[in-house]
């Protein structure tokens, strides 16, 4: 089964730069998996930002523009990213990945 | 079906002002990001400005920044563009587009002609 | 901001012909990111590809993308002539989104 690492504990990034988290995948091959990020506002629900496919294929959230997240795979170091771009006061918040296995 | 129709174009002087409007149906507008993107006569297309369905996040290219305005109403099915200190350089065709969940504008309008002209 | 420039501006060919369209981006954007429109005169532009390989819906299986890291590819195996058009690359992987110059695929 696979299992999944957030290494990066906090991240502190100053207004309009660019924050890139990452999610480590073991046991299991990352491009024979989708991964999922989510995040998880103070006081709101957990909601689905982006996702990877086994082949490559993004899906975003309908309600986030384009551009906002950037979501890809390193499959030599079994890693897939989150890149936040031009980082506001909302992106305030705790971010996961999960992990779908094909 | 999928329809989005825009108006509000027309002409306009140097420093004028315009608003922009896009009529959405054939979908559920409030859950999905849109964008304005404008097209020059005879030139390629360029990307104006987007907002997302609840209007937290908004962008704009540097070259509108602090001049236009995107905003929407979810319950009058409509997204908007103010054009304020209109300069000649912005006459264009305008389109609104939906953001793609997989990436890209999958549905556009006709376009509206804006004309910026002493 | 990312650049990305579409060669050649123009391609003259004939029906049947295979069309290779180029877009270099001045700096990595990932294959995940990338799309390709059409365009005719007094239309608006028509969803064709993204990611850089999936088809939008109704698109012909004449049209495929390629491409990663600076250097992406949309190929017309056989052109019919309703694929004589404005072809432009886009990238949506950040903010600002752009898009490429454009190139005219049109009839030798």
């Known amino acids: 089964a696979g299992h999944l690492e957030q290494p990066q504990i906090s991240s502190t990034k100053t207004l309009s730069k660019t924050a890139r988290l990452e999610c480590v995948v073991s046991g299991i091959t990352i491009s024979a998996t989708s991964v999922y990020w989510y995040r998880e506002r103070p006081g709101e629900v957990i909601q689905f930002l982006v996702s990877i496919s086994y082949d490559g294929t993004v899906r975003k959230e309908s309600g986030i523009p384009s551009g906002k997240f950037e979501v890809d795979r390193i499959p030599e170091t079994s890693t897939s990213t989150l890149t936040i771009h031009n980082v506001e006061k909302q992106d305030i918040a705790t971010y996961y990945c999960a992990l779908w296995e094909v | 079906e999928v329809q989005l129709v825009e108006s509000g174009g027309g002409l306009v002087k140097p420093g004028g002002s315009l608003r922009l409007s896009c009529a959405a149906s054939?979908?559920?507008?409030?859950?999905?990001?849109m964008n304005w993107v404008r097209q020059a006569p005879g030139k390629g297309l360029e990307w104006v400005s987007s907002?997302?369905?609840?209007?937290?996040?908004?962008f704009y290219a540097d070259s509108v920044k602090g001049r236009f305005t995107i905003s929407r109403d979810n319950a009058k099915n409509s997204l908007y563009l103010q054009m304020n200190s209109l300069r000649a350089e912005d006459t264009a065709v305008y389109y609104c587009?939906?953001?793609?969940?997989?990436?890209?504008?999958?549905?556009w309008g006709q376009g509206t002609l804006v004309t910026v002209s002493s | 901001e990312i650049v990305l420039t579409q060669s050649p501006g123009t391609l003259s060919l004939s029906p049947g012909e295979r069309a290779t369209l180029s877009c270099r981006a001045s700096?990595?954007?990932?294959?995940?990111?990338l799309a390709w429109y059409q365009q005719k005169p007094g239309q608006a532009p028509r969803l064709l590809i993204y990611?850089?390989?999936n088809r939008a819906t109704d698109i012909p299986d004449r049209f495929s993308g390629t491409g990663s890291g600076t250097d992406f590819t949309l190929t017309i195996s056989r052109l019919e002539p309703e694929d004589f058009a404005v072809y432009y690359c886009?990238?949506?992987?950040?903010?600002?989104?752009?898009f490429g110059g454009g190139t005219k695929v049109e009839i030798k």
């Open positions: 990611g850089p390989s």
């Open positions: 587009g939906r953001d793609h969940d997989y990436g890209g504008l999958d549905y």
């Open positions: 907002i997302g369905s609840s209007s937290s996040y908004i």
């Open positions: 700096q990595s954007v990932s294959s995940s990111y």
């Open positions: 054939g979908f559920t507008f409030s859950v999905y990001s």
């Open positions: 886009q990238q949506y992987g950040r903010s600002p989104l752009t």
